[in-house]
């Protein structure tokens, strides 16, 4: 049985303020069952950019339908970035429980905002 | 075709125990969640117990007497269920999770189910 | 736990003619809900899946609406096979999967 991995594939993305980000994840199992959320930064002080659960997330869209079946595409969209979105956004699967714990965080990659071109 | 074949029912006595088992076919057993849901006689649908890879989850109500199990090489799910009770009569079917990308699981394809009678 | 509220419990219709019935959770479950179709003595079958998304092979007349807390199945042009169970099921909070009670639809 193959064991999960979450591949996160860009260690860097450059966006100019006011843009999108695409932040992309993807994993290789639907095992262990549960949910994926994007984080950014980590430990304690780490914020929640999404899930399905809490929001709304006006900025953030997922780049494959919510809908799909058997989905393994967990890509997410930022829209108006600012120099305030700047950091290391990590893509982490939860093992469903009471509550759900986490089970394995992507490589992380590390979002960098230029400045808006004049 | 996807299918799914409940076996293993039968009449049992109060305290008893009984082993269902549900072979599956059409598809890559291995990848999918499965689910056994019952129905008592002339009564709605609950949910019993799930089983991904090595996590199970189970009801309330069968906590602690049942198990629910799988056996990958020989695609057949599993529920072992014990200290049974009047109150487990009922139709066991076994279902194929399907995963809904950001959200959780419903069933796709079912069994035709098999009878479990508790009795004295 | 989240309880799924099914009504009318029993609906009487002509064949030809629509049928709509409800399903009410009682917290918020967004889209996560599916529909089933119970004939007797048969297994139950998926119909809808995210409220409103038909299963492959489906119908058209069946369709599914609404979201949050309130749900709605309709079948447009009852047949003769469509006189069955229907449930609903919330696959938002688990454990555990929860079952509405059921909606019977019998001919009038």
């Known amino acids: 049985e193959e064991e999960l991995q979450i591949i996160q594939p860009d260690k860097s993305v450059s966006v100019a303020a006011g843009e999108s980000a695409i932040l992309h994840c993807t994993i290789t199992s639907l095992f262990p069952v549960g949910p994926i959320q994007w984080f950014r930064g980590a430990g304690p002080a780490r914020v929640l950019i999404y899930n399905q659960r809490q929001g709304p997330f006006p900025r953030v869209t997922t780049v494959s339908e919510t809908t799909k079946r058997e989905n393994m595409d967990f890509s997410i969209s930022i829209s108006n970035i600012t120099p305030a979105d700047a950091g290391t956004y990590y893509c982490i699967k939860f093992r469903k429980g009471s509550p759900d714990t986490e089970f394995k965080s992507g490589a992380g990659t590390e979002l960098s905002v230029r400045a808006k071109p004049s | 075709d996807v299918q799914l074949l409940e076996s293993g029912g039968g009449v049992v006595q109060p305290g008893g125990s009984l082993r269902l088992s549900c072979a599956a076919s059409?598809?890559?057993?291995?990848?999918?969640?499965m689910t056994w849901v019952r129905q008592a006689p002339g009564e709605g649908l609950e949910w019993v117990s799930t089983?991904?890879?090595?996590?199970?989850y189970y009801a309330d109500s069968v906590k602690g007497r049942f198990t629910i199990s799988r056996d990958n090489s020989k695609n057949t799910l599993y529920l072992q269920m014990n200290s049974l009770r009047a109150e487990d009569t009922a139709v066991y079917y076994c279902?194929?999770?399907?995963?809904?990308?950001?959200?959780?699981?419903?069933?796709?394809?079912w069994g035709l189910g098999t009878l479990v009678t508790v009795s004295s | 736990e989240i309880v799924l509220t099914q009504s009318p419990a029993t609906l009487s219709v002509s064949p030809g003619e629509r049928a709509t019935f409800s399903c009410r959770a009682s917290q918020n479950v967004k889209n996560d809900l599916a529909w089933y179709q119970q004939r007797p003595g048969q297994a139950p079958r998926l119909l809808i899946y995210?409220?409103?998304i038909r299963e492959t092979g489906i119908p058209e007349r069946f369709s599914g609406s609404g979201s949050g807390t309130e749900f709605t199945l309709t079948i447009t042009s009852l047949q003769s096979e469509d006189f069955a169970v229907y449930y609903c099921q919330q696959y938002y909070d688990w454990p555990p999967f929860t079952f509405g009670g059921g909606t019977k639809v019998e001919i009038k």
């Open positions: 059409g598809f890559s057993f291995s990848n999918f969640a």
């Open positions: 995210a409220a409103r």
């Open positions: 089983i991904g890879s090595g996590d199970t």
């Open positions: 279902a194929k999770d399907s995963t809904v990308s950001w959200s959780g699981d419903f069933f796709d394809y």
